[in-house]
Structure formats: structure tokens, C-alpha cells
Amino acid sequence: RDTTVKPGAKKDTKDSRPKLPQTLSRGWGDQLIWTQTYEEALYKSKTSNKPLMIIHHLDECPHSQALKKVFAENKEIQKLAEQFVLLNLVYETTDKHLSPDGQYVPRILFVDPSLTVRADITGRYSNRLYAYEPADTALLLDNMKKALKLLKTEL
């Protein structure tokens, strides 16, 4: 779903139907520690020397909903995610580096502790480089490992 071409897409970006007390996880992994803002996430990444994983999504997007379920239920992804600073956003930031090829959702980007957006860590769709679908969990896991490995080689 491309949030740039849909008039009024921003109306979807509020958590309008919380079933439980809303947490920063927004259902992407309630046992994980999530940051609240992009600025906080960048600061934590730099000071902890951990890579940052940013998930852009919308509550009322079927593909965001579907990816969220497999992300939250995949034990390997949840375990590996503990090694990242985590942020999920239902709004767009002003940082254009976080939308290298458009403001579609869901998309996942990695940022290293030097605050460089890892534009080279991509999914498998040439028209939406940072998109992932439920069938892409193995690739997402590989990309998470790649982000961690690259971090280690940069130390």
C-alpha cells in the first residue's frame, strides 16, 4: 500500500481500535522493548551500538496486518529482534532516508549505529525494495542477521 498516492491516508495512522491497553509494540511483539520516537531510537542505537530496525505500517492496511501476525508469531524473528533497537511507526517521519523509494507500507529498514540507513539491505521486490510479505520471513531473518553481522564488522 502506497501512502503517498492515497488522499487522506493519514486518517488510518491512528490506533483507532485498541482491544487491549495500547503498547508501543502495536502488536509486533509485546515482549520486546520498543522505542517511542525516531529521535529516541537513533539515540539508543548510537549509545548502545545496536542496529535499529524500523517498521512502517498502517493499522487499516491488510498487508501490514498480515506481516504483523507472522512477525509476532515467529520465534526466531522475535529472538533476533532482541538484539536491535526497535521502532514501529504508523506515521511518516520527515527523514527522507527512511523512504528511499517511496512511502509504501509495510516496509522495514535498518539503520546502523553510525546512523547510516542501510539502503543495501532490501527485500525481494524490485518496485518496493523494503517491502516484506508473510512469505518472506526467511529473507527478513537473513536481513536481520546481515544487519547484525555488518555491525560487528564495523566495530
Epitope: 500500500r1 502506497d2 498516492v5 492515497k6 482491544k19 487499516e60 492496511c61 491488510p62 498487508h63 496486518q65 498480515a66 501476525k69 507472522v70 508469531e73 509504501y104 518496485n127 518496493r128 510479505e133 508473510p134 512469505a135 520471513t137
Partner: antibody, heavy 120, light 107 residues
Framework: QVQLVQSGAEVKKPGASVKVSCKTS????????MNWVRQAPGQGLEWIGW????????NYNGKFKDRVTLTADKSTSTVYMELSSLRSEDTAVYFC?????????????WGQGTLVTVSS | DIQMTQSPSSLSASVGDRVTITCKAS??????LSWFQQKPGKAPKTLIY???RLVDGVPSRFSGSGSGQDFTLTISSLQPEDIATYYC?????????FGGGTKVEIK
């Protein structure tokens, strides 16, 4: 193999409610979205909504939002679609349709359909 | 809601003919489009998902193409058992919406 078996035909009066069931087997029930679609006699297909049986999350077509409730019973691997305040234009065949095996949104397997007739 | 315009609404072709059905979305839906076959009195059967991926067990004479707003279902060589109504569905955005259907008959 994957099977979706729906409950039998129903005849209801205007203003009443109907609850259609879809009993599933042959896959991990909690990890595939279940959609509901209806088809009025001689007409096309219309999406009603979906539910994720793992946690009960739902999304409804705005047209039905105030009248439809989707639920799932993990103990029997069954999903339910309840439609209230029935009117004659709700006469249709109601289908359940499972999403992709990997949790993807596309509709992969269909139930055989349940005819609901609304008549006074 | 996204409108799905399917054409033609009906067609008549001979056995062995190449048949093409088109579906146009009112806005960009990426590749989130499926095609279904429905025979009278039966449930729909899924043929294709994500615009061009053939469902297991579906004959290879069926193929799908397109992305963005314009999509095509092709039957490379029409068989008697292909007589049915065909529907497209967009699942890019809620609510999911179907095309109006194309009834395929044998000449």
C-alpha cells in the same frame, strides 16, 4: 488436505439474525486469515470481512460493520459469521474463504457456501 | 473503495481459442490481484494470486499478468471444462473488492 465445511441452509424472517459456521481441517487454524464473502442470487461476489483466528483480530467491510460479527473457536477450529437485522437483500450464498497458508491475505480455499434466505 | 472494472462481461469462444479477460483497478493496487473461476452452483476456485502466481493444481493454460491498475487473465487454449464465470479481486486495501465477472461460453 485443507477442508472448509459450512453449516446448512437457513431461512430467516426480516429483522432476525443468522449465524453461519465454517469448520476447518487440514492446516494450522490459528495462522491463516479467514474471509467471508457473499453472493446474492445471479449476482457477483462481495467481501464481508476477515478474522485472524489466532487472536480474533477482525476487519469488516464498512457496509456491514454495524451488523456483522466474526468469531473463531480455536478448540473446534471453527469460524462463525453472524449477521443481524436481516433484510430481504441479505438473501445470498455466504462463503468462508481461507487466506494463504503462510498468513498472506489472498483467498486460497473456499467453503461450499451456505444459502441464507430472508423472507417474511 | 477501490472499483474493479472487468471486461468483457461475457464472451463466446471456440475450443482451442486464446481467451483474454481484463480487470482495471480505480487506483494502483501493486500486484495484489487474484483471479477466480466459478461454475454454476459451486464455490469459486482460486486460479491466480499476486497477479501472476498460479495456484498449485491449476492447469498451465491459465496465466495472469499486469501490475498497478491493469491486469489480464489469459486462457491459452480454451477447453470445454473452462466454461464458467471468472472474477478478479483486489486485496491491496480494505474493503477487498471484486470485479463484476466475465461469463465464458463455448461457441
Amino acid at each position: 488436505q485443507v477442508q472448509l465445511v459450512q453449516s446448512g441452509a437457513e431461512v430467516k424472517k426480516p429483522g432476525a439474525s443468522v449465524k453461519v459456521s465454517c469448520k476447518t481441517s487440514g492446516y494450522v487454524f490459528s495462522r491463516s486469515w479467514m474471509n467471508w464473502v457473499r453472493q446474492a442470487p445471479g449476482q457477483g461476489l462481495e467481501w464481508i470481512g476477515w478474522i485472524y483466528p489466532g487472536d480474533g483480530d477482525t476487519n469488516y467491510n464498512g457496509k456491514f460493520k454495524d451488523r456483522v460479527t466474526l468469531t473463531a473457536d480455536k478448540s473446534t477450529s471453527t469460524v462463525y459469521m453472524e449477521l443481524s437485522s436481516l433484510r430481504s437483500e441479505d438473501t445470498a450464498v455466504y462463503f468462508c474463504a481461507r487466506g494463504g497458508y503462510d498468513g498472506s491475505p489472498w483467498l486460497s480455499y473456499w467453503g461450499q457456501g451456505t444459502l441464507v434466505t430472508v423472507s417474511s | 473503495d477501490i472499483q474493479m472494472t472487468q471486461s468483457p462481461s461475457s464472451l463466446s469462444a471456440s475450443v482451442g481459442d486464446r481467451v483474454t479477460i481484463t480487470c482495471k483497478a480505480s487506483q494502483d493496487i501493486n500486484s495484489y490481484l487474484s483471479w477466480f473461476q466459478q461454475k454454476p452452483g459451486k464455490a469459486p476456485k482460486t486460479l491466480i494470486y499476486r497477479a501472476n502466481r498460479l495456484v498449485d493444481g491449476v492447469p498451465s493454460r491459465f496465466s495472469g499478468s499486469g501490475s498497478g491498475q491493469d491486469f489480464t487473465l489469459t486462457i491459452s487454449s480454451l477447453q470445454p471444462e473452462d466454461i464458467a464465470t471468472y472474477y478478479c479481486l483486489q486485496y491491496d486495501e480494505f474493503p477487498f473488492t471484486f470485479g463484476g465477472g466475465t461469463k465464458v461460453e463455448i461457441k
